[in-house]
Interface confidence: medium
Amino acid sequence: TIPPHVQKSVNNDMIVTDNNGAVKFPQLCKFCDVRFSTCDNQKSCMSNCSITSICEKPQEVCVAVWRKNDENITLETVCHDPKLPYHDFILEDAASPKCIMKEKKKPGETFFMCSCSSDECNDNIIFSEEYNTSNPDLLLVIFQ
């Protein structure tokens, strides 16, 4: 991942195009890897991650992983390619503009994960279904 202070540039190594041949630009995501968190029993939380990074690859999206076990709560924020599994799970919601947490089955812990495709969208992680939009894909067309 490129450090946040580095200016974006498009060179031959970075050029990725969509189906129409348009250039896709790398996304900005919160990227603090795994950190202890106080986020618990809330409808939504901020990541409290102060590092905004330019994702290494243009196809990468923002991901957040919330985990709770008997000892602690952690929040992981990263960039990741949605074509590849993360923590053995497919990023089903990678096109969403918002990071809406979905619970995944993991033995011995409570495990929630979300992914999203707007800049720094993994800064605001949402647990409550009432935060769901009527059509996140269409919102993505309008705002991202």
Epitope: C99, N124, L140, V141, I142
Partner: antibody, heavy 121, light 107 residues
């Protein structure tokens, strides 16, 4: 500095066509979704149409579906709105605006100065 | 579509007054609410996004609050350049919709 400059407005008869353009400078055009928002004389703002950053997806408000078509040329930093089968109720100032999605917060900023479309016989 | 209703439609105030404009959504929109200022013949200008975040370059006399369905824009001390029309806009669901506007006039 960021600039959005609309052009192509004018007087057209009902049933006629116009093509609006929005020339953009000061930011990486191909990284942002863009929208058209209109304002009828003395009235409020109405979102009309949007296109994704790469141009592969677009969405129109119901009242213009099948009549208006949004497109963009990222190599020319230009947004377009092709308006066909125009009606009197399409008379408005048309603004182009940059769509922003940051931390799940969605808004339009900045906006162009607008171009007036008048549909009248 | 989500309907946005502003009140009042217009108000008269003097320089230095505290002005409050309200915006109500027809359903919960969390904090996906933006405020714009528009002067005659000009483009709308973003003031507040996400209900309470002040856009860069906007004077601190402007503030926003609210969540769910009820939102407020406050101008703590009205200045001559603040006489304009103000619009709220929800960006929670498609299509994005605006309030009808509140015109702030000189008393």
């Amino acid at each position: 500095q960021v600039q959005l400059v609309e052009s192509g407005g004018g007087l057209v008869q009902p049933g006629g066509s116009l093509r609006l353009s929005c020339a953009v400078s000061g930011f990486t055009f191909g990284r942002y979704a863009m929208s058209w928002v209109r304002q009828a004389p003395g009235k409020g703002l109405e979102w009309v149409s949007a296109i994704s950053a790469s141009g592969d997806r677009h969405h129109n408000t119901d009242s213009v579906k099948g009549r208006f078509s949004i497109s963009r040329d990222n190599s020319k930093n230009t947004l377009y709105l092709q308006m066909n089968s125009l009606r009197a109720e399409d008379t408005a100032v048309y603004f182009c605006a940059k769509g922003i999605a940051k931390s799940g917060k969605n808004y339009f900023d900045p906006w162009g100065q607008g171009t007036l479309v008048t549909v009248s016989s | 579509d989500i309907q946005m209703t502003q009140s009042p439609s217009s108000l008269s105030a003097s320089v230095g007054d505290r002005v409050t404009i309200t915006c109500r959504a027809s359903q919960s929109i969390s904090s996906y609410l933006n405020w714009y200022q528009q002067k005659p013949g000009k483009a709308p200008k973003l003031l507040i996004y996400a209900a309470s975040s002040l856009q860069s370059g906007v004077p601190s006399r402007f503030s926003g609050s609210g969540s769910g369905t009820d939102f407020t824009l406050t101008i703590s001390s009205l200045q001559p350049e603040d006489f304009a029309t103000y619009y709220c806009q929800q960006s929670y669901s498609t299509p994005p919709t605006f309030g009808q506007g509140t015109k702030v006039e000189i008393k």
